[in-house]
């Protein structure tokens, strides 16, 4: 904490200008008011303060706005905002998407994943929901950052928004949050021909139930193998060798690459290996001819 | 051949929280989506929601503060936990399975349980 | 929320004639309704899909037709086992929504 000082009467301040990069930390703290520094916020980031400037600067804010900053100043942090912690951004309330926009901008390039992740968080909350206009800023500005939601959070985004979602976006999404993804797209997407729905649902297909994997098996649509390797473990298990061979198509032959990777290697597993030696790639450790297949599972539902 | 079947008190008292359970057999429950709909007596029906077996749901926003549906992969079952009923809550609660085929395209139900009468009275 | 409004509530038709029921949707639904069957004490049973899609196993008298806000269901010559409530549902969004019910009685 900065020690409490009086300030000198010629330091005194009545506006925030290029002269306070000469106050020592000590004299910012004692001269800068913080109702003045909020309400000149939007000056503060033309200004080239040192980092521990703006900790004083910060520190100024905080105690002003003890329960989270208003929008009024948030809008104008600038490089300011790097000084912020998830914990102070959890405190506020954004609304704007051009205050969305200007924090993007500013966190590029620094090692803010954190901090935007619950920035955009606090900005869904804001908003009531992941509209469209929220999902558009966040692809433009930040690419990869709709991942960074949580599951709960993308479920506000109306079905209606899917298709304004890229491929790229959801590279760095995992299962919990294709799970929520995936049924909206399969809305969103229903109307559409095969191929043209294909290759719409394709980067949904990570959160795709068995069914609708084995149904997209008899649609011609020769899935390739990074597709297929990001399908979950439980709705490739079930499927036929069959089932798959139709599914790739083409990129059949991919399997053999991946043999030892999940999920390929549990499907092979589960397979019988004359059915694996149908597909002529040499696929190992399938089940031995004339082994019986009990499926506990299913019996234990029954029971 | 997959079955469903709702279990669960068939009394609860006002303000209190409806608690049911469907089983479904004969099949897993990571293959499709789960939903549960209802039926007041002499009415129509009403979508509650849906869940998937990783524990991911869509609810009816009508009734979305008060619902909450959950899974157990391990017993084959989903649940469905409605808080804070009133009389306007009687009705036959149903599970049922969405179609899950993308060569159809829809959320619609082909398979449904055989019902539940849940009345909600003092 | 979409909602589904049939006609009539109630329809009184003769074993072996035509029975048409209508389903009108507040706003476009394209081609996402499904209708149903249910029998006194029985769950649903689902009919159609896709507005115009027998599912497996229903009889070819049973018909749809319509895309956008209004649907058919048709039944070309009623059996004894056709007098029930028919209901459609929308899927065209979030929430899925049901129509009230038409009750088909013998005449």
């Known amino acids: 904490d900065v020690e409490r000082t009086t300030c000198p009467p010629e330091k005194e301040v009545h506006e925030i200008d290029e002269s306070l990069i000469f106050y020592k930390k000590r004299e910012l703290e004692a001269c800068v008011d913080a109702a003045l520094l909020a309400a000149q916020m939007d000056r503060v980031d033309a200004i080239p303060f040192t980092y521990e400037q703006l900790d004083v600067l910060k520190h100024k804010l905080d105690e002003l706005y003890p329960q989270g900053y208003p929008e009024s100043v948030i809008r104008h942090l600038g490089h300011l905002f790097l000084k912020m912690s998830p914990e102070d951004i959890r405190k506020w309330n954004v609304t704007s998407l051009e205050t969305l926009k200007a924090l993007l901008k500013v966190s590029k390039g620094h090692e803010m994943s954190a901090q935007v992740a619950t920035l955009i968080d606090r900005v869904v909350v804001g908003r009531g929901q992941l509209d469209k206009d929220t999902v558009d800023t966040l692809t433009a500005f930040c690419p990869g950052c709709l991942c960074s939601l949580s599951p709960e959070r993308l479920s506000s985004v109306p079905p209606s928004v899917i298709g304004a979602v890229r491929p790229q976006d959801l590279d760095t999404c995992g299962p919990r949050q294709l799970d929520v993804l995936y049924p909206k797209a399969r809305l969103a997407f229903q109307n559409m021909s095969g191929s043209e729905y294909f290759v719409k649902i394709r980067p949904f297909l990570g959160g795709a139930p068995t069914e609708d994997v084995k149904a997209l098996s008899q649609q011609n649509v020769s899935m390739d193998l990074a597709t297929f390797m990001k399908l979950r473990r439980e709705a490739v298990l079930p499927l036929t060798v069959a089932e798959v061979q139709k599914l790739l198509g083409p990129h059949v032959e991919g399997l053999k690459v991946e043999e030892q990777h999940s999920p390929v290697r549990d499907w092979i597993l589960k397979q019988r290996q004359d059915d694996l030696d149908t597909l002529g790639l040499g696929l190992q450790g399938g089940i031995p001819n004339g082994y019986l297949i009990l499926d506990l599972s299913v019996r234990e539902a029954l029971s | 051949q997959v079955q469903l079947q709702e279990s669960g008190p068939g009394l609860v008292k006002p303000s209190e929280t409806l608690s049911l359970t469907c089983t479904v057999s004969?099949?897993?429950?990571?293959?499709?989506?789960w939903s549960w709909v209802r039926q007041p007596p002499g009415k129509g029906l009403e979508w509650i929601g849906y869940?998937?077996?990783?524990?991911?749901?869509q609810s009816n926003p009508s009734l979305k503060s008060r619902v909450i549906i959950s899974v157990d992969t391990s017993k084959n079952q989903f649940s469905l936990k409605l808080s804070s009923v009133t009389a306007a809550d009687t009705a036959v609660y149903y599970c049922a399975r969405e179609v899950g085929r993308i060569a159809v395209a829809g959320w619609f139900f082909d398979l449904w349980g055989r019902g539940t009468l849940v009345t909600v009275s003092s | 929320e979409i909602v589904m409004t049939q006609s009539p509530a109630t329809l009184s038709v003769s074993p072996g004639e035509r029975a048409t029921l209508s389903c009108r949707a507040s706003?476009?639904?394209?081609?996402?309704l499904a209708w149903y069957q249910q029998k006194p004490g029985q769950a649903p049973r689902l009919l159609i899909y896709g507005a115009s899609t027998r599912a497996t196993g229903i009889p070819a008298r049973f018909s749809g037709s319509g895309s956008g806000t209004e649907f058919t269901l048709t039944i070309s010559s009623l059996q004894s086992e056709d007098f029930a409530v028919y209901y459609c549902?929308?899927?065209?969004?979030?929430?899925?929504?049901f129509g009230q019910g038409t009750r088909l009685e013998i005449k």
């Open positions: 706003q476009s639904v394209q081609s996402n």
């Open positions: 004969g099949g897993s429950i990571q293959n499709y989506y």
């Open positions: 549902q929308q899927y065209n969004n979030w929430p899925l929504t």
């Open positions: 869940i998937f077996y990783s524990g991911s749901t």
